[in-house]
């Protein structure tokens, strides 16, 4: 593994990013700061490319499938929460084939700076930006009611993920500005349909007083769908991510529908996960068990075909489901939970000034913001034997109560040499039926000076397509010294959050 | 409270260029939008444009695209309106408001008289 | 651009009256979008009505507001010496946000 050019790799990292925008499931697109590292390895005919690329969140929804750059900014003023990013990415590419990008997997840390940046030296917080975004859902609710009284063709739509939260207190009022994906649930699906998505921002505001957040003075919503059977692949891999998923046996173009507009409304655009209080579940039960009762549950998993098994699944909660290797000294490939939580109960701060919201929380309890070298974490296992599952055609979202037994897809493909996944206490290994790739992991608002903890560098094997050896595995461990003409410059628009990054990696 | 002060009257000169400042107290400036608005006796009130001083980000109406430049110093709390090219279609009074995220403009600057003559 | 015409321009109304001005869209504007503002000579325009009917602290009870899609009215319901003021009417549904032209109000 050499290191390279920053800026001679800029297209591959634009390509990478705009790859794992498509592969994610919810959230809002990445938009591209800076390559902060890259080197790369030729093995045989494919550049192997390791890549480490500083982000900041858009205001538009990975639902859109836009390409990162292609995000306007909304013609609306909402508050807009500023969050940043870093991922670290392996992606390879065929000589033969130069248009032939592919992400192999990539783990993403993001945290909130916005209330870093504020300068509240003289001044009362006004605005805050709340982590724990599932609170809100009876606001959300409330506003797709009030949508689908205007629009008969949201009728059977559902509130899927809560995903930001903002308030504003002003001398007239306060607004709750709440975002959030929704999902078609028709009555009728024999046979069934690819679900369609779509995305809401609501704007609800109170009189200064006012308790009761059920009866906001005022409400505006606008929705806009995106209807995956005119879509690249929202239900999975886009091209070159891997064999693409298919509804029926059809793979799916990429445009979608114009924006959903009440008659009147404003062209309003626009800025977290949901998590529990109290232990999480066992791991069979984790997907159906969070968030208020069906049909309010998770959002789904992404529906699959059996072929496409050994590439991604996406997880619920923006850090997505990995699977875990048996052996303890070496329990997990990318160590992170689904459910952002605390297992050991530390809260990531003891106190965050101007939130007064539980946090996206941290799954060994300790705070983010000391450096682990090599991005590693300081527990050598997970505490909890947290499984991907892989439903068989079909996810469990806010349209479906949950088979009392999954079908696991994949029949037929073994386990990974020494692979087996954990079921949790008591329940013994059952073979291994999908790996899951790629993580995005949300951590607690990062206060001033302090630094973006990098992500986890530990991906595991993966053979190369195409490649003589298959199960000999072809990519290096992920470097960890500073390529010499990285990192590139930051791209113009955001200047101040280049201090939230680290500027070189542990030695 | 809330308040945000604007430069003194400008006297300018056609084809000069000038740069009129507002300092915003008593809240988070970085957060919100900094509106301009521009007053011309018999004119009404025009939006020129806008700026969120924690990010840079700008939109200006397209009438004032190149007549107006927006910048905004987060260290001193202060927004700037730079207009150049001057011509006597340029005096005017202009307004610094803070947007308030309810869809109006809730604080107001006191105005910058801005005449432009040979 | 949403243009939006005010009327009269100009008007005057002996104390104790009625007084209603009018405020037309040139495309249609949501009433959370339509706002007022009160401007007395040498001062800053002051937000006096929002989304369409609600009276921004501090302004009397005698004002009100009303309208929806491109027709909006301010209605004050007994004019008094210090409603003296130009009105001006606000759309921020879509930009470039616009302004009326102004009613002027004066004391006949």
């Known amino acids: 593994v050499s290191p390279t050019d920053c800026s001679a790799v800029e297209p591959e990292a634009e390509k990478a990013l705009d790859l794992i925008n498509k592969r994610r499931r919810d959230g809002y697109l990445f938009q591209l700061l800076r390559i902060a590292d890259a080197h790369l390895d030729r093995v045989e005919n494919t550049t192997v490319y390791y890549l480490v690329l500083d982000v900041q969140e858009s205001d538009c929804s990975v639902l859109s499938r836009k390409y990162w750059n292609d995000c306007e900014p909304p013609d609306s003023r909402r508050p807009s929460e500023i969050v940043i990013g870093q991922c670290k990415v392996i992606a390879t590419r065929h000589s033969h084939e130069s248009q032939d990008l592919r992400v192999i997997d990539f783990n993403c840390t993001t945290s909130s700076v916005s209330s870093a940046l504020a300068n509240t030296k003289d001044s009362p917080v006004l605005i805050d930006f709340f982590e724990d975004t599932e609170r809100y859902r009876k606001q959300a609710n409330k506003a797709l009611e009030k949508y689908k009284e205007e629009n008969d063709d949201f009728a059977s739509f559902r509130v899927d993920r809560i995903e930001r939260v903002a308030r504003v207190r002003g001398g007239e009022g306060t607004g709750y500005f709440v975002d959030f994906s929704v999902r078609n649930c028709p009555r009728h699906h024999f046979p069934r349909h690819p679900n369609v998505f779509g995305f809401c921002r609501a704007d609800l505001f109170y009189d200064v007083e006012a308790l009761d957040l059920e009866s906001p003075k005022n409400l505006v919503i606008n929705c806009e769908v995106f209807d995956p059977q005119e879509h690249e692949n929202i239900n999975g891999v886009p091209p070159h991510l891997g064999h693409p998923f298919h509804w029926g046996g059809h793979e799916r173009s990429s445009t979608t529908k114009p924006p959903f507009k009440p008659h009147g409304s404003r062209d309003h655009h626009h800025p977290h996960k949901p998590h529990e209080h109290g232990p999480p579940p066992p791991p069979d039960e984790r997907d159906h068990s969070h968030g208020p009762p069906l049909p309010q549950g998770p959002p789904p998993l992404l529906p699959m075909s059996c072929s496409s098994c050994q590439h991604a699944t996406f997880g619920t909660n923006g850090a997505q489901r990995h699977s875990h290797n048996n052996n303890s000294s070496d329990l997990h490939p990318h160590k992170h939970h689904s459910h952002e939580q605390h297992p050991h109960g530390h809260h990531p701060h003891a106190h965050h000034p101007h939130e007064h919201d539980t946090h996206r929380q941290h799954p060994h309890g300790h705070h983010p913001h000391g450096h682990h070298p090599h991005g590693h974490h300081p527990h050598g296992h997970h505490p909890h034997g947290h499984h991907p599952h892989c439903h068989d055609f079909q996810d469990y979202g806010p349209c479906d109560p949950p088979p009392h037994n999954q079908g696991h897809c994949c029949h037929g493909h073994g386990p990974p040499p020494g692979h087996l996944r954990r079921r949790g206490p008591g329940k013994g290994p059952r073979p291994f039926h999908c790996r899951q790739i790629g993580s995005v992991y949300r951590l607690p608002p990062l206060r001033k000076g302090e630094v973006l903890p990098l992500p986890e560098a530990n991906f595991p094997s993966f053979p190369l397509p195409h490649h003589k050896h298959p199960l000999k595995p072809d990519n290096q461990p992920f470097p960890q010294s500073v390529s010499e003409s990285c990192p590139g410059k930051f791209k113009s628009g955001f200047p101040q959050v280049s201090m939230f990054f680290t500027h070189t990696f542990p030695k | 409270q809330v308040q945000l002060q604007q430069s003194g009257a400008e006297l300018m000169k056609p084809g000069a260029s000038v740069k009129i400042s507002c300092k915003a107290t008593g809240y988070t400036f970085s957060s919100y939008w900094i509106e301009w608005v521009k007053q011309r006796p018999g004119h009404g009130l025009e939006w020129i444009g806008e700026i969120l001083p924690g990010s840079g980000r700008t939109n200006y109406n397209e009438k004032f695209k190149g007549k107006a430049t927006f910048t905004a110093d987060t260290s001193s709390n202060t927004a700037y309106m730079q207009l150049s090219s001057l011509t006597s279609e340029d005096s005017a009074v202009y307004y610094c408001?803070?947007?308030?995220?309810?869809?109006?403009?809730?604080?107001w600057g006191q105005g910058t008289t801005l005449t432009v003559s040979s | 651009d949403n243009v939006l015409t005010q009327s009269p321009a100009i008007m005057s109304a002996s104390l104790g009256e009625r007084v209603t001005m009018t405020c037309t869209a040139s495309s249609s504007v949501s009433s959370s979008y339509l706002h007022w503002y009160q401007q007395k000579p040498g001062s800053s325009p002051k937000l006096w009505i929002y989304?369409?009917?609600n009276l921004a602290s501090g302004v009397p009870a005698r004002f009100s507001g009303s309208g929806s899609g491109t027709s909006y009215s301010l209605t004050i319901s007994s004019m008094e010496a210090e409603d003296a003021a130009t009105y001006y009417c606000?759309?921020?549904?879509?930009?470039?946000?616009?302004f009326g032209g102004g009613t002027k109000l004066e004391i006949k």
């Open positions: 989304s369409t009917s």
């Open positions: 408001a803070r947007y308030s995220y309810f869809y109006y403009f809730d604080y």
């Open positions: 606000h759309q921020y549904h879509r930009s470039p946000w616009t």
